[in-house]
């Protein structure tokens, strides 16, 4: 039950990539507005996105306080222009979100190959260490800072003239691979958190190939 003409939010969904975290829901409001509250399992509710006509709310600032905590959000529905009005039970209609643990569930963003350098038959490939919105001592942490050795990168590399993708793995942001002399190679990387059971992989980075600007070649 609830106030006449007010409908409860539904399909509450967390959308999160590299800890940038937005709660989305339905329906688009007709003569109603929403307010979101978020809390840890043991904490107090904090209100966000007051009386909004949006169907999303950016909760990044809250979840980055402790990305290993489990969060719950709820979306309250109020009649437009009468936000003090409550339902028949004495409080506004609301719907709970699924629980969300950022460290375990945030999607890994698409990585970027920062550079590659060939020295003889070795190539060093470096992955950009992307900055997140997680803060410590007033500085933003990188993905590596947050995940540490839980985060690995898989490198796919192949001769420009062939289709078979060899792989290499690292728990740093650098690869050192063997290549055949005189051959051009292409590279793509994928971020992986093997200890997860879902959302383990990122999408692949854009492909970078030798003979393009990003790389450097040195004959030894």
């Amino acid at each position: 039950s609830g106030t006449t003409n007010t409908v409860a939010a539904y399909n509450l969904t967390w959308k999160s990539t590299n800890f940038k975290t937005i709660l989305e829901w339905e329906p688009k409001p007709v003569n109603q507005v929403y307010t979101v509250q978020i809390s840890t399992k043991s904490g107090d509710w904090k209100s966000k996105c007051f009386y909004t006509t949006d169907t999303e709310c950016d909760l990044t600032d809250e979840i980055v306080k402790d990305v290993k905590q489990t969060y719950l959000a709820r979306v309250f529905s109020y009649p437009a222009g009468n936000v003090e009005s409550t339902g028949s039970a004495g409080e506004p209609l609301y719907e709970n979100s699924p629980e969300f643990t950022p460290y375990l569930e945030t999607n890994l963003g698409q990585p970027t190959i920062q550079s590659f350098e060939q020295v003889g038959t070795k190539v060093n490939v470096t992955v950009e260490d992307e900055r997140t919105l997680v803060r410590r001592n007033n500085t933003f942490l990188s993905l590596r800072d947050v995940f540490g050795k839980d985060l690995i990168y898989t490198l796919y590399y192949w001769k420009s003239s062939s289709s078979g993708k060899k792989t290499a793995k690292t728990n740093t942001n650098e690869f050192l691979i063997d290549v055949d002399k005189g051959e051009n190679y292409c590279f793509s990387v994928q971020a992986v958190i093997p200890s997860r059971t879902v959302n383990r992989k990122s999408t692949d980075s854009p492909v970078e190939c030798m003979g393009q600007e990003k790389g450097e070649f040195r004959e030894i």
Epitope: S163, K165, P194, N199, K201
Partner: antibody, heavy 120, light 107 residues
Framework: EVQLVESGGGLVQPGGSLRLSCAAS????????IHWVRQAPGKGLEWVGY????????YYADSVKGRFTISADTSRNTAYLQMNSLRAEDTAVYYC?????????????WGQGTLVTVSS | DIQMTQSPSSLSASVGDRVTITCRAS??????VAWYQQKPGKAPKLLIY???FLYSGVPSRFSGSRSGTDFTLTISSLQPEDFATYYC?????????FGQGTKVEIK
């Protein structure tokens, strides 16, 4: 419970084709990598190839390159091994296995295998 | 491709014996070596990963070690259910490669 079940094996003539399936349950294949490994009667294990179902990337052993193709249907949570131009030396039990994908752990779960016999 | 040379190809032992199987990689593979146990008509089972770590549910009589490019699987006290074939595998580079296998038989 993680499970891999191979099917599609059987008797085929030299030069013929066969498609093996590897149906996965208890995990989502696009979050992992799937390998095919074979074992000729009385012989050791031979790696055939892998697929990353999330992007379709593959790599094959030299012995099967150009004849075998690995694919995946993520909606069915199933990987496939298409074998063409089969030879007597391809006779083996074919296993699919899940690659955990960490630096430390590779093939952590295997299917029960399916026998492929190439003979006239 | 990296070769994994496994020895011996077979051995006979009695229940309670200490058994050692070795694998030598043709080049550096760091610790990216696994050991598998296979019984007749069955799929291989992971025993040891990352050269020396015991996989979940595997009895503690199994252990693995590394010295450079040499890798060892040890069964401290052979049990009746341990009679099987054992394989090493490197997954440091593509393609991954297996050793030839060691058949552990009853003396």
């Amino acid at each position: 419970e993680v499970q891999l079940v191979e099917s599609g094996g059987g008797l085929v003539q030299p030069g013929g084709s066969l498609r093996l399936s590897c149906a996965a349950s208890g995990f989502t294949i696009s979050d992992y990598w799937i390998h095919w490994v074979r074992q000729a009667p009385g012989k050791g294990l031979e790696w055939v190839g892998y697929i990353d179902p999330s992007n379709g990337y593959t790599y094959y052993a030299d012995s099967v390159k150009g004849r075998f193709t690995i694919s995946a249907d993520t909606s069915r949570n199933t990987a496939y091994l298409q074998m063409n131009s089969l030879r007597a030396e391809d006779t083996a039990v074919y296993y699919c296995a899940r690659d955990y994908g960490s630096l430390e752990v590779s093939l952590d779960y295997w299917g029960q295998g399916t026998l492929v016999t190439v003979s006239s | 491709d990296i070769q994994m040379t496994q020895s011996p190809s077979s051995l006979s032992a009695s229940v309670g014996d200490r058994v050692t199987i070795t694998c030598r990689a043709s080049q550096d593979v760091n610790t990216a070596v696994a050991w598998y146990q296979q019984k007749p008509g069955k799929a291989p089972k992971l025993l040891i990963y990352s050269a020396s770590f015991l996989y979940s549910g595997v009895p503690s009589r199994f252990s693995g070690s590394r010295s450079g490019t040499d890798f060892t699987l040890t069964i401290s006290s052979l049990q009746p259910e341990d009679f099987a074939t054992y394989y090493c595998q490197q997954h440091y580079t593509t393609p991954p490669t297996f050793g030839q296998g060691t058949k552990v038989e009853i003396k």
